[in-house]
């Protein structure tokens, strides 16, 4: 069977060669070919070329649309997981671990503490902070979590804040705070999460996370 296929391919190739040669002869105006024959062959060839060019255009259009879809409006999303830190800073630390998401380089986690975006637009930004505290062991002030914005050359802004009173449970009672909202971010803008007492934050799987999604 393979041998027969090979013979068939060679025959088709030979026919193509003859067809091309005939077009060449038509073009040079060889006497042995009738005018009618040449016209027919030429229009056949033009038809082939037109088909090829149309296909090429369609492919080009499809590709440019794909590029537009992919390039102009790529998905930008991030979800990072809390990381226990020895630092006494009130800014929570995050890591790309576990069930994390970092869609592409248009959003980055910088210094383990802030998500920075490269494109301007509306973003849904959220954070969940789970903490374990006890009324007696803690100060009178409530546990406060803040979602903050820092843009290049501009002061920090508090976008969202939530407060919870401390639990009476011993040694401590777990509580969760969820923050989320839609905000306009400029290129280079960073968002981060601040808490009043980072030592009370729970870092167990799924308890504390932070992320954003470009709308």
């Amino acid at each position: 069977h393979r041998r027969l296929d090979k013979i068939e391919d060679e025959r088709n190739l030979h026919e193509d060669f003859v067809f091309m040669k005939t077009i060449q002869r038509c073009n040079t105006g060889e006497r042995s070919l009738s005018l009618l024959n040449c016209e027919e062959i030429k229009s056949q060839f033009e038809g082939f070329v037109k088909d090829i060019m149309l296909n090429k255009e369609e492919t080009k259009k499809e590709n440019s649309f794909e590029m537009q879809k992919g390039d102009q409006n790529p998905q930008i999303a991030a979800h990072v997981i809390s990381e226990a830190s020895s630092k006494t800073t009130s800014v929570l630390q995050w890591a790309e671990k576990g069930y994390y998401t970092m869609s592409n380089n248009l959003v980055t986690l910088e210094n383990g503490k802030q998500l920075t975006v490269k494109r301007q637009g509306l973003y849904y930004i959220y954070a969940q902070v789970t903490f374990c505290s006890n009324r007696e062991a803690s100060s009178q002030a409530p546990f406060i979590a803040s979602l903050c914005l820092k843009s290049p050359g501009r002061f920090e802004r508090i976008l969202l804040r939530a407060a919870n009173t401390h639990s009476s449970a011993k040694p401590c009672g777990q509580q969760s705070i969820h923050l989320g909202g839609v905000f306009e971010l400029q290129p280079g803008a960073s968002v981060f999460v601040n808490v009043t007492d980072p030592s009370q934050v729970s870092h167990g799987t799924g308890f504390t996370s932070f992320g954003l999604l470009k709308l």
């Epitope: 301007q120 290049p152 050359g153 501009r154 002061f155 920090e156 802004r157 508090i158 306009e184 400029q186």
Partner: antibody
Framework: EVQLLESGGGLVQPGGSLRLSCAAS????????MSWVRQAPGKGLEWVSG????????YYADSVKGRFTISRDNSKNTLYLQMNSLRAEDTAVYYC??????????????WGQGTLVTVSS | DIQMTQSPSSLSASVGDRVTITCRTS??????ANWYQQKPGKAPKLLIY???RLESGVPSRFSGSGSGTDFTLTISSLQPEDFATYYC?????????FGGGTKVGIK
């Protein structure tokens, strides 16, 4: 009612120093970024310096960088501007202004009445 | 630093006139443009922030528009108390900068 009251202005010789104060009331001072803006006689407004609510971040106009220092004492609800190596071109009315914290756009929504600083020999 | 070019530097108008002041920036500042009104011997007063948002308590005859590099302050029907100097300001990037001002005088 929000109030900002500047003090400390006066006549000083070139190369001298002066410290301006701005007493704030009617709002939670530490929640707001603050700025100093000046206006030379018969001229336009010039932003001089700004400080974040916590006092951790400061910004300066190039014309005063290295000579002026902005600071704040949140326990006293007071904003300061320490002016050193003063020049004749620093002569102006100095306004203290509050930066609206609830906006993306950092507008200066409340202003003091200003204090005049004259640098002359 | 971002330069703010305000025009005209002065204009004369009558009560009831529509007045337009423009501000052009040396680079795009998105919508980070604010407008202030200042009367002689007084502190400036915020009118418009974020290019088009009217500050609380400011009459609706004042409006702002624009984004990027071109911004406009419009007073739809000039009132006697509107004769003052108007300044645009950018807060896109420090150092914040002001336009040179536009003095609106009586014709």
């Amino acid at each position: 009612e929000v109030q900002l009251l500047e003090s400390g202005g006066g006549l000083v010789q070139p190369g001298g120093s002066l410290r301006l104060s701005c007493a704030a009331s009617g709002f939670t001072f530490s929640d707001y970024d603050m700025s100093w803006v000046r206006q030379a006689p018969g001229k336009g407004l010039e932003w001089v310096s700004g400080i974040s609510g916590s006092g951790a971040t400061t910004y300066y106009a190039d014309s005063v960088k290295g000579r002026f220092t902005i600071s704040r004492d949140n326990s006293k609800n007071t904003l300061y501007l320490q002016m050193n190596s003063l020049r004749a071109e620093d002569t102006a009315v100095y306004y203290c202004a509050r930066d609206s914290s609830g906006s993306y756009y950092y507008p200066l929504d409340y202003w003091g009445q200003g204090t005049l600083v004259t640098v002359s020999s | 630093d971002i330069q703010m070019t305000q025009s005209p530097s002065s204009l004369s108008a009558s009560v009831g006139d529509r007045v337009t002041i423009t501000c052009r920036t040396s680079q795009s500042i998105s919508s980070y443009a604010n407008w202030y009104q200042q009367k002689p011997g007084k502190a400036p007063k915020l009118l418009i922030y974020g290019a088009s948002r009217l500050e609380s308590g400011v009459p609706s005859r004042f409006s702002g528009s624009g984004s990027g590099t071109d911004f406009t302050l419009t007073i739809s029907s000039l009132q006697p108390e509107d004769f003052a100097t108007y300044y645009c300001q950018q807060t896109y990037s420090t150092p914040w900068t002001f336009g040179g001002g536009t003095k609106v005088g009586i014709k």
